[in-house]
Interface confidence: medium
């Protein structure tokens, strides 16, 4: 029940840090329009990965797109790529995890496919959320970078009279987004791993069964297994992982976290 | 076709108030900023501020900051202005107008309405 | 406050004339964004509310006459008339629409000679 919840928990979690990551990488409001030196300004400028817009007095917005690829800086080019990387690899994780869930069949694969795909789908998850922080990590860090630059020479102007305030930029939401997406994706993906060893048989092939005839208790040590000629009510066939045979007796009854459910 | 009808001339006494209305039509009041303008006899023109009617939030010349209120009245689509504590230099014509270009949409304004303030 | 000057406070001209009248602004209206200068210039007959002419320093309101046209960048701006008619016998006001709050020049009234 834990390693569904826990699985469980972690597809949720990853989902909504996808959802985030593609959000922010959508978002225009990648770096903003710093007011401090300039609050009266009736015009907001605001820029994205793939525009920049403006908003006027009026309410009015104009966004132009970047349709140039070659003449951007390159690392824009290099936050673009991370964000689209962690996208695709979080798409291909919520479509592996949705088949690793515990609690959805699929004909009959096996506890050992779905952890393995859980453990897939959990580092896929990992890598996403990384190249998410990294990205949006590198475009703050650019800001910062170029923040203080337009500091350092902010007002221009001839002999003083004429003031020219060179626009300068800060964070804009969606790098908290992006941080926030990317977090809750690598958590995601955490869970998922953690589900993965719970999910996980300690050892695949099973040495012995043990089943009840319906008269006394013999042992059979075979490959797999086999079925019984007794169909008493209280036949059953179960799973001895450590080697030796037993009697139905001395085998608990009690589900294993191994069944499957 | 969108109208900005402003109230008639108002006369007031030095010290008294007025409120003057510009009913707007033809156009989704709430979807764009209302400025208002002073012009006095012979003079220039004076930006006092401006209101949205969706949100109601303000932003005033801080010149008359303490003089004029922006207010308005969705379910009219009228915008206001009161004037308080009048005085002779107050006497002027004030224009409502919207102000939205860059796009389909153009600049209108109103008539104008004139306030006298004279003891 | 951003400081609008106007020049020529008055100009005498004849039908058919090029006119040319000058704004100059304390502060560079030109906004790094889009590169685009937010200034305005105005049309205001006697008894009349002001009509928008140019916005954007060069960018004509529709259904203005093509004689009309602006230019200039940063802080110095131009309106010009390439061949006055009897209607264009008006004031002319130019307006930072940049920063708050919105300042208007003391106007350049176009008279008759």
């Known amino acids: 029940m834990a390693v569904t919840a826990c699985q469980g928990l972690g597809f949720v979690v990853s989902l909504i840090g996808i959802a985030g990551i593609i959000a922010a990488t959508c978002m225009d409001q990648w770096s903003t329009q710093d007011l401090y030196n300039n609050p009266v300004t009736a015009v907001f400028n605001y820029q994205g990965l793939w525009r920049s817009c403006v908003r006027e007095s009026s309410g009015f917005t104009e966004c132009r797109g970047y349709f140039t690829l070659l003449g951007l800086p390159a690392m824009l080019q290099a936050v673009r790529a991370l964000m689209i990387v962690g996208i695709v690899l979080g798409a291909i994780g919520l479509l592996v995890s949705i088949f690793a869930l515990k609690c959805i069949r699929i004909g009959s694969m096996e506890d050992s496919a779905k952890a393995n795909m859980t453990l897939t789908s959990g580092i896929m998850f990992i890598v996403s959320g990384l190249c998410a922080i990294a990205g949006v990590s590198v475009f703050a860090n650019m800001l910062v970078t170029n923040f203080w630059m337009s500091t350092a020479n902010m007002y221009t102007g001839m002999g003083g009279m004429v003031q020219t305030v060179q626009t300068r930029y800060t964070f804009g939401a969606a790098l908290f987004v992006g941080w926030v997406a990317g977090g809750l994706t690598l958590i995601g993906g955490v869970m998922m791993c953690i589900a993965c060893r719970g999910l996980a048989p300690e050892e695949t092939n099973y040495k012995a069964v043990s089943y009840h005839a319906s008269g006394h208790s013999v042992a059979y040590k075979p490959g797999g297994f086999k079925a019984s000629t007794g169909f008493g009510s209280n036949t059953k066939n179960k799973k001895i992982y450590d080697g030796g045979a037993r009697t139905e007796d001395e085998v608990q009854s009690y589900p294993s976290k191994h069944d499957y459910v | 076709q969108v109208q900005l009808v402003q109230s008639g001339a108002e006369v007031k006494k030095p010290g008294a108030s007025v409120k003057l209305s510009c009913k707007a039509s033809?156009?989704?009041?709430?979807?764009?900023?209302m400025h208002w303008v002073r012009q006095r006899p012979g003079q220039g023109l004076e930006w006092i501020g401006m209101?949205?009617?969706?949100?109601?939030?303000?932003n005033y010349n801080e010149k008359f900051k303490s003089k004029a209120t922006l207010t308005v009245d969705k379910s009219t689509s009228t915008a206001y202005m009161e004037l308080s504590s009048l005085r002779s230099e107050d006497t002027a014509v004030y224009y409502c107008?919207?102000?939205?270009?860059?796009?389909?949409?153009?600049?209108?304004w109103g008539q104008g309405t004139t306030v006298t303030v004279s003891s | 406050d951003i400081v609008m000057t106007q020049s020529p406070s008055s100009l005498s001209v004849s039908v058919g004339d090029r006119v040319t009248m000058t704004c100059k602004s304390s502060?560079?209206?030109?906004?790094?964004?889009?590169?685009?200068?937010?200034l305005t210039w105005y049309q205001q007959k006697p008894g009349q509310p002001p009509k928008l002419l140019i916005y954007w320093a060069s960018t004509r309101e529709s259904g203005v006459p093509d004689r009309f046209s602006g230019s200039g960048s940063g802080t110095d701006f131009t309106l010009t008339i390439s061949s006055v008619q009897p209607e264009d016998f008006a004031t002319y006001y130019c307006?930072?629409?940049?920063?708050?709050?919105?300042?208007f020049g003391g106007g350049t009234k176009l008279e008759i000679k």
């Open positions: 209101i949205h009617p969706n949100s109601g939030s303000t």
């Open positions: 033809g156009y989704t009041f709430t979807s764009y900023w």
């Open positions: 502060q560079s209206l030109l906004n790094s964004g889009n590169q685009k200068n937010y």
């Open positions: 107008a919207r102000r939205y270009y860059g796009s389909i949409s153009p600049d209108y």
């Open positions: 307006q930072n629409d940049y920063s708050y709050p919105f300042t």
